[in-house]
């Protein structure tokens, strides 16, 4: 074709030398990211799907960049942030995953994003009938209104002296302890 | 290694302008380009990056307001309807950074810049 | 949207003393940080890249620290020459991300 290294073939800052035999006047050597006979061709990068967990593949030019989706970060967006590794739920909380996020469920007593807010167990009113909620270390006591009965005071005492309790499994009287 | 910006000037609300940005001793097509501006008196504003395969890609608040583009020794920028807010000097930097790895750590910084150039929009 | 936040404004510290500069991410930035000194009338100049590495030709009495989304630039043995306005600076690279590159406002320091 008569081309030589003096016609500025080598495109994209390829480096022109020229050729050893009479068919091949001059071989452009690419630099990285570009190839081809002239280094017209620009190398797809990214087609190699380096980013993971659904992140955006940006080809800078100097450097490949992963743009991450929401809950995922690092350079090939491998840290999964809604994970619950490395997420301390405290007093005693555990961590649960799902939707995309996560969450503490709190002990009893606890609450909040990571169960270090003291929660009153009695807010939630859960003595019935008037019984009166205290709180406790180990949860809640409810002192029952005269007349009721029952962990939260939810069964009514009759006036001969039997509970309107739920009726007994076969085999089981009322006051058996369940096995 | 240098960048330098022309094109800044006098222009009333409303006229297009375009600025550009010369560069010698590296190829475009190798490295990102980014434009940056400063009102007076003010901070640092990035407006947006063009990549070494020629995509722009712009901050939220710049788009359909600025557009990025380049050849292979000149990257502009076009102001398309200037309002006085856009008094600034215009800077292009390079863009560098640590090559794609699986380090945890890699980074992007611009050098070197260019000494700006001054779009006053006034009527 | 990633919100890089300065601190303090404006510092002043007399020749020889020492200053630290604040720069807090609103997400983990991973040490995608830089900072650039700018003087009045003149360009940014690179000083620290990646958090902690310096520039060549930066004197060694530019420090830079820092990881997640707290960083620190302490400049010690404070000459008059450094008398300008510092700027951090991050690459955050999500889909949701309205700036990829934002800068921090700018600390001026001022030597006496």
């Known amino acids: 074709s008569g081309v030589t290294c003096a016609d500025g073939p080598c495109f994209n800052g390829g480096l022109c030398v020229g050729g050893a035999d009479p068919d091949s006047a001059y071989i452009c050597h690419c630099p990285p990211g570009f190839q081809g006979s002239n280094c017209e061709k620009r190398v797809d990068r990214c087609s190699l799907q380096p980013c993971r967990n659904g992140g955006l593949c940006l080809d800078l030019g100097h450097a490949l960049r992963c743009r991450c989706r929401a809950g995922f970060a690092g350079p090939r967006c491998e840290h999964d942030l809604d994970d619950c590794a490395g997420r301390a739920c405290a007093n005693g909380g555990t961590c649960v995953e799902g939707g995309g996020a996560h969450r503490c469920s709190c002990a009893l007593g606890f609450g909040g994003r990571d169960c270090r807010e003291r929660a009153d167990p009695c807010a939630a009113r859960p003595c019935a009938h008037g019984g009166r909620c205290y709180a406790h270390f180990s949860g809640l006591v409810c002192a029952c209104a005269p007349g009721y009965m029952g962990a939260r005071c939810e069964f009514p005492v009759h006036p001969d002296g039997a509970s309107a309790l739920p009726a007994a499994p076969p085999g089981l009287r009322p006051g058996d302890p369940q096995r | 290694q240098s960048v330098e910006e022309s094109g800044g000037r006098l222009v009333t609300p409303g006229t297009p302008l375009t600025l550009t940005c010369t560069v010698s001793?590296?190829?475009?097509?190798?490295?990102?380009m980014s434009w940056v501006r400063q009102a007076p008196g003010k901070g640092l504003e990035w407006i947006g990056i063009?990549?070494?395969?020629?995509d722009p890609y712009y901050a939220s608040w710049a788009k359909g307001r600025f557009t990025i583009s380049k050849t292979s020794t000149t990257m502009d920028l076009k102001i398309t309807s200037p309002t006085t807010e856009d008094t600034a000097t215009y800077f292009c930097?390079?863009?560098?950074?640590?090559?794609?790895?699986?380090?945890?750590?890699?980074?992007?910084?611009?050098?070197?810049w260019g000494p700006g150039t001054l779009v006053t929009v006034s009527s | 949207a990633l919100v890089m936040t300065q601190t303090p404004s404006s510092v002043s510290a007399a020749v020889g003393g020492t200053v630290t500069i604040n720069c807090q991410a609103s997400?983990?930035?991973?040490?995608?940080l830089a900072w650039y000194q700018q003087k009045p009338g003149q360009r940014p100049k690179l000083l620290i890249y990646?958090?902690?590495n310096l520039e060549s030709g930066v004197p060694s009495r530019f420090k830079g620290s820092g990881s997640g989304t707290e960083y620190t630039l302490t400049i010690s043995d404070l000459e008059c020459d450094d008398a300008a306005i510092y700027y951090c600076?991050?690459?955050?690279?999500?889909?949701?991300?309205?700036?990829?590159?934002?800068f921090g406002g700018g600390t001026e320091v001022v030597v006496k």
């Open positions: 930097a390079r863009m560098i950074g640590s090559e794609y790895a699986s380090s945890s750590e890699y980074y992007d910084a611009f050098d070197p």
């Open positions: 001793g590296f190829s475009l097509s190798r490295y990102a």
């Open positions: 063009i990549t070494g395969g020629g």
């Open positions: 997400q983990n930035i991973y040490s995608n």
């Open positions: 990646g958090a902690s």
């Open positions: 600076q991050s690459a955050y690279y999500t889909t949701s991300v309205d700036v990829l590159y934002p």
